[in-house]
């Protein structure tokens, strides 16, 4: 299921017009495309441009991140007269052509996301030969990647004094909330440092100091669902060491 | 850290050929056209030739056309231009340049001299 | 083809102070609005061309915010405020917006 999200001021889509009214670059993108990871997504986009009936050489493009300067993430050619965009990359094979650029359409799909793939995506395309030109959206579409919690990493580490504390990283998105449970601690949020910097949809909570043995577990939930995983505290009493 | 590294030129007669070539790193070579700009002893610049992403597409400055060919290839990461009846005023540094479009030409090799002479 | 016209051919400059150099197209260089196909390019002597700023005012990487650039549709400028002894070299207007691409036939650089 893919949501295309409504901007009221451009009625769906955002449209960059450019030059005169007799010749003038267009392109047409939705502000953002919401899908669930595991799922695909379309990303559209269609454009209009000022050399009526070319039929040259053309490539494709979508790129990530930033327009003009983003890695591109999908490339296509195609020959004089032909309407086949041949594929020349499709990052991890997970990028295919929905549109057909002769008919000013690039729209492409994104199969199998990842909450890596929740940035922004500009299309591009690209004449070659006797009519030399090329235009790129500049406002993009924002894919945002939603996803049921799933717990990363739990674990239990040595503190300073002999004690111990536990960590526990979830991610999803929306960024979910954690908690803690565990022998006389009840229900508890403990530390939350949420959401890491560079790691949008990485959320830890950290429980710092383990008083009792037993069990322990985090549970991660957001709207999508909830997710828990348990780690075990074990200490030899009269050493120093414990077992987890 | 982007690198263009450009093989060595050298002296040749006119009418004869010589190919050069370009060795890239520290960039995604396939994501990007690449140029050959020239630049005759104490004179300005010049582009020669660009090619596309795919080596598909070329583009030619029309005193070179029919006698360069540019061409690369993204697996060896490696541009080349291929220079037949070469002439006396083909004399000069060889550069090859990484075209950005809207990032202009990013990124200069050390340039390679050629110099067309009897 | 698209003729890129430098003025001045040369400039000296006392250290600390300011330079301009001004290039002008034979055709305007705007695409589309906020997309002007204008580059400047510095080359120091013995070395390759190095790119200053693109799309008229965007400083390249590396470059210091003394370089700064400016201009639209055919008329461009680059100004160099405190100008030090390093950014002695000829500098050069270029185009992306046609082919043949061009380039302007440079201005030189002196320290005083």
């Known amino acids: 299921f893919v949501r295309t999200k409504i901007d009221t001021t451009e009625n769906l889509l955002n449209t960059e017009v450019h030059s005169s009214p007799a010749q003038r670059w267009s392109m047409q993108v939705p502000p953002e495309v919401s899908a669930e990871a595991g799922d695909a997504a379309v990303l559209p986009c269609t454009f209009t441009h000022p050399h009526r009936h070319y039929d040259g050489p053309l490539t494709a493009i979508w790129r990530a991140g930033e327009p003009y300067a983003g890695p591109q993430v999908f490339r296509c050619a195609a020959a004089r007269g032909s309407e086949l965009c041949q594929t020349a990359l499709s990052l991890h094979g997970r990028f295919r052509l929905l549109g057909n650029p002769r008919r000013n359409d690039l729209s492409l799909r994104v199969e199998r996301l990842a909450l890596a793939d929740d940035r922004r995506y500009f299309c591009r395309v690209e004449f070659a030969g006797d009519v030399h030109d090329r235009y790129e959206s500049r406002h993009g579409v924002r894919l945002h990647v939603t996803a049921a919690p799933r717990i990363v990493n739990i674990s239990v580490l040595p503190s300073p004094a002999h004690a111990f504390r536990a960590l526990c990283t979830a991610e999803g998105e929306p960024p979910p909330a954690l908690a803690w449970s565990g022998p006389a601690l009840g229900n508890s949020l403990a530390a939350v440092r949420s959401p890491r910097e560079g790691h949008g949809h990485l959320v830890t909570a950290e429980l710092p100091a383990l008083t009792h043995d037993g069990r322990y577990t985090c549970t991660a939930a957001n709207s999508l669902g909830r997710s828990e995983a348990s780690v075990y505290l074990f200490r030899f009493h009269g050493a120093s060491g414990a077992s987890t | 850290e982007v690198q263009l590294v450009e093989s060595d030129g050298g002296l040749v007669q006119p009418g004869r050929s010589l190919k050069l070539s370009c060795a890239a790193s520290?960039?995604?070579?396939?994501?990007?056209?690449l140029a050959w700009v020239r630049q005759a002893p104490t004179k300005g610049l010049e582009w020669v030739a660009s090619?596309?992403?795919?080596?598909?597409?070329?583009y030619y400055r029309d005193s070179v056309k029919g006698r360069f060919t540019i061409s690369r290839d993204n697996a060896k990461s490696t541009l080349s231009l291929q220079m037949d009846s070469l002439r006396s005023e083909d004399t000069a540094t060889y550069y090859c340049?990484?075209?950005?479009?809207?990032?202009?030409?990013?990124?200069w090799g050390q340039g390679t001299l050629v110099t067309v002479s009897s | 083809d698209i003729v890129m016209t430098q003025t001045p051919l040369s400039l000296s400059v006392t250290p600390g102070a300011s330079a301009s150099i001004s290039c002008r197209s034979s055709?305007?260089?705007?695409?589309?609005?906020?997309?002007?196909?204008v580059f400047w390019y510095l080359q120091k002597p013995g070395r390759s061309p190095r790119l200053l700023i693109y799309?008229?005012?965007n400083l390249a990487s590396g470059v210091p915010d003394r370089f700064r650039g400016s201009g639209s549709e055919t008329d461009f400028t680059l100004k160099i405020s405190r100008v030090e002894a390093e950014d002695v070299g000829i500098y050069y207007c270029?185009?992306?917006?046609?082919?043949?691409?061009?380039f302007g036939s440079g201005t030189k650089l002196e320290i005083k």
């Open positions: 340049a990484r075209q950005d479009w809207e990032g202009g030409f990013a990124y």
């Open positions: 520290g960039f995604t070579f396939s994501d990007y056209y």
């Open positions: 090619v596309s992403y795919d080596g598909i597409t070329n």
């Open positions: 055709k305007s260089l705007l695409h589309s609005p906020g997309l002007t196909y």
């Open positions: 799309r008229v005012s």
């Open positions: 270029g185009q992306l917006l046609e082919n043949p691409f061009t």
